[in-house]
């Protein structure tokens, strides 16, 4: 019996088609992805093949103005239109709190939303009961397939799930649910979830009875053969894990941003064992036409976004200096504003010993593309912020050793004076450079804001200590020559859309007046 699994993950609000790098579509003839194009391909496969499931492994939320404006209603609407069969909860589904998940998505989705390792307690338990499930048994042809969900247990550090949701260890939580499915005579089981490729592989290895793992969170691109675009495969598709009980378990993920549709064909025997698995992600490029009815719906929903872009978010009473003459040479108040917003967006008081789990921010000056003039009545709009941060990136959470941070700050000024983009703006860091010294030895003082303290203060950076840092995904991926970050990071979790982080902060503060205050000397 053959099952076709179509899957997406980490779509992050890319409802409209995008450019090849998943930023805003400029030249339509070269654009990719988007729900209208996805629907065309899904329908084509549904017509051609008998047993098809369309699954999403989480993080539909967060990433473009679509989410900022529609707050998840767009996810429910278009996933319903595409007739998804199931979705796992990702960490970003909690970005607007539990209410921001329940109302727009859980109550509106016509498909099951799953996570076995999230347990509700207190007053939330009855409110959320039945709105998401640990597993769902789906009829497919004359067979049944069990789908069991999971979500990163780091979610409390990455999003805003509140205090009434407990995120358990994935493997510990999944095993009893899989065992229950087995007792119900469900012998074909897919683990669908959002904890990253390493955890996906562990689940395949450790959870007895899981036949296939469909994952997300790490934006992992797998491919067999010559890849069709710029993404470099992390392994073959599917990636085969040998389980502890001696089975070959296929593990898949489909990169991110709706650029690809994962396509996996599984052959099951009478006992539900995987006899064979093969496939590849399908690149959703312009050779696949956009479905006209979905496209028309997208255009209808688009109107509200254009109106939103020009509305006032808040005011500034000072010039926001985002000029390259400032931000690539010295501390600039636009850099300070953005870093303050980045830290504010990551306030998570999850431990009494820590005032916050992260206190530091770094930001490449070259990523700040425009100033904002306060003489326009001080008004700041989304449109203004899109000029400052035009690349559609995210502000991510990483863990780095002190020694890596030191290297990063040396790199920041290794060719100082040439107006290059690697000059770092900071938050929660005091750095002193001596530019008379030779490159690689110019950082003379590097103090960082403590987290395990009730009164935050600056202490010297310790080379062997592991620090959490918020930074643009561009830097996490080694951009602007920050190869040491990419090579040495100990953990990387993708965060919220850059403009959204700054716009939320400005809306919260109402009036802003960031200063140059001696963070960089």
């Amino acid at each position: 019996w053959e099952l076709t699994i179509l899957h997406t993950n980490d779509v992050h609000s890319r409802l409209e088609q995008t450019s090849e790098d998943s930023s805003k579509c400029v030249n339509a003839s070269r654009c990719m992805g988007g729900v209208a194009r996805l629907f065309t391909k899904v329908q084509q496969i549904r017509r051609a093949e008998p047993n098809v499931l369309l699954l999403d492994a989480g993080d539909q939320y967060q990433g473009t103005i679509w989410f900022t404006v529609y707050k998840g209603a767009e996810v429910a609407h278009f996933m319903n239109a595409l007739r998804y069969d199931a979705m796992a909860l990702g960490n970003h589904e909690f970005d607007n709190g539990v209410e921001g998940l329940i109302e727009p998505l859980l109550k509106e989705a016509k498909f099951p939303i799953l996570s076995a390792n999230i347990k509700a307690k207190g007053p939330l338990a009855s409110q959320i009961s039945g709105l998401y499930l640990p597993y769902k048994v789906l009829p497919v042809g004359d067979e049944v397939v069990g789908i069991v969900g999971y979500t990163s247990k780091e979610t409390p550090f990455l999003s805003n799930p509140g205090t009434n949701l407990v995120f358990e260890d994935e493997i510990t939580a999944l095993q009893p649910e899989v065992d229950k499915l087995k007792t119900l005579n469900v012998n074909k089981i897919i683990a669908l979830g959002h904890s990253g490729f390493e955890m996906d592989k562990l689940i395949a290895q450790k959870v007895r009875g899981v036949d296939v793992v469909v994952g997300g969170h790490s934006n992992t691109f797998l491919y067999t053969g010559n890849p069709p675009s710029k993404e470099v495969p992390a392994g073959k598709y599917p990636f085969i894990v040998t389980s502890d009980d001696g089975r070959k378990v296929p593990v898949v993920q489909a990169y991110a941003f709706g650029k690809y549709l994962g396509y996996l064909k599984i052959e099951f025997d009478e006992r539900g064992n995987v006899i064979s698995s093969h496939g590849n992600p399908i690149l959703l490029n312009s050779s696949i036409p956009e479905d006209p009815s979905i496209k028309a719906d997208i255009n209808k929903w688009r109107i509200k976004l254009d109106n939103y872009s020009t509305q006032e978010l808040g005011k500034t009473i000072v010039y926001l200096d985002g000029s390259s003459q400032s931000c690539r040479f010295r501390e600039c108040n636009m850099g300070n504003l953005i870093c303050d917003a980045m830290i504010n967006n990551n306030l998570r008081h999850t431990d009494e010993m820590f005032w916050n789990h992260v206190s530091m921010c770094i930001l490449n000056g070259g990523g700040i593309r425009s100033p904002i003039d306060e003489r326009n009545n001080g008004t700041i709009t989304w449109e203004n912020l899109a000029a400052v941060l035009p690349f559609g990136g995210t502000f991510d959470l990483v863990q780095l050793k002190g020694s890596t941070l030191k290297k990063a700050f040396e790199h920041s000024v290794h060719r100082y004076g040439q107006s290059t983009g690697e000059f770092l703006q900071v938050g929660g860091i005091h750095v002193v450079y001596d530019l008379s010294r030779k490159p690689g030895d110019r950082v003379v003082k590097l103090d960082v804001l403590c987290t395990k303290c009730r009164v935050p203060s600056y202490d010297p950076l310790k080379m062997d200590e592991v620090y959490k840092v918020i930074l643009p995904n561009f830097l996490a991926n080694g951009g602007d020559g920050f190869q040491m970050i990419k090579d040495e990071l100990l953990r990387h979790d993708s965060g919220d859309q850059d403009i959204n982080v700054v716009s939320t902060y400005i809306s919260k503060m109402k009036v802003i007046y960031p200063a140059v205050e001696g963070r960089i000397k």
């Epitope: 019996w1 042809g141 005579n185 070959k248 009478e270 006992r271 064992n273 995987v274």
Partner: antibody
Framework: EVTLKESGPVLVKPTETLTLTCTVS????????IQWVRQPPGKLLEWLGV???????DYNAAFISRLTISKDTSKSQVVLTMTNMDPVDTATYYC???????WGQGTLVTVSS | DIQMTQSPSSLSASVGDRVTITCRAS??????LNWLQQKPGKAIKRLIY???SLDSGVPSRFSGSGSGTEYTLTISSLQPEDFATYYC????????FGGGTKVEIK
């Protein structure tokens, strides 16, 4: 639980027709095929034929003129019919799942007058 | 038709021994190979499917490997209950079996 069980006569006269039934539980014949295999006493396993989930059948070329495999999906039963039986057809007859994950106990059929 | 050549046809071994049985296919069968165990008066039991995946409840001392036309069943440490006849079965085309290997007590 996935099980298969063969049933039918234990003794068949030469030139007669053998009819064996394989009753399936734990999976659907609309999703999976059933294979038939036999083993003469002290000899090797020999594939006879298969009926696929869609209802079509394939046969070992050596038996194509004598063998018919059919099914009744609603009853979860597959029927093997072999005509013109001969003493050399004495064997244990097995039905098995399409992928060999499950086998019946086998039924010993003796062809003798 | 695909022919399967299995060797040895029989072997004598002691408890604790490592036993290896091989099957050669007449053409590439792309990992579509089972190993079966047959004991007198018992139903045939599949031990390994798709070349190397272990069936549920089968001890981990059994392992399978191979690709293309060459396939191997290994019993890492022979136990008393392992004395039986073993067959390879290819299902890339119409089923064909190896000639069997009878594992006997030395």
């Amino acid at each position: 639980e996935v099980t298969l069980k063969e049933s039918g006569p234990v003794l068949v006269k030469p030139t007669e027709t053998l009819t064996l039934t394989c009753t399936v539980s734990g999976f659907s014949l609309s999703s999976y095929g059933i294979q038939w295999v036999r083993q003469p006493p002290g000899k090797l396993l020999e594939w006879l034929g298969v009926i696929w989930s869609g209802g079509s059948a394939d046969y070992n070329a050596a038996f194509i003129s004598r063998l018919t495999i059919s099914k009744d999906t609603s009853k979860s039963q597959v029927v093997l019919t072999m005509t013109n039986m001969d003493p050399v057809d004495t064997a244990t007859y097995y039905c098995a799942g399409q992928y060999g994950s499950v086998w019946g106990q086998g039924t010993l059929v003796t062809v003798s007058s | 038709d695909i022919q399967m050549t299995q060797s040895p046809s029989s072997l004598s071994a002691s408890v604790g021994d490592r036993v290896t049985i091989t099957c050669r296919a007449s053409q590439d069968i792309g990992d579509r190979l089972n190993w079966l165990q047959q004991k007198p008066g018992k139903a045939i039991k599949r031990l390994i499917y798709a070349t190397s995946s272990l069936d549920s409840g089968v001890p981990s001392r059994f392992s399978g490997s191979g690709s293309g036309t060459e396939y191997t069943l290994t019993i890492s440490s022979l136990q008393p209950e392992d004395f039986a006849t073993y067959y390879c079965l290819q299902y890339a085309g119409s089923w064909t079996f190896g000639g069997g290997t009878k594992v006997e007590i030395k």
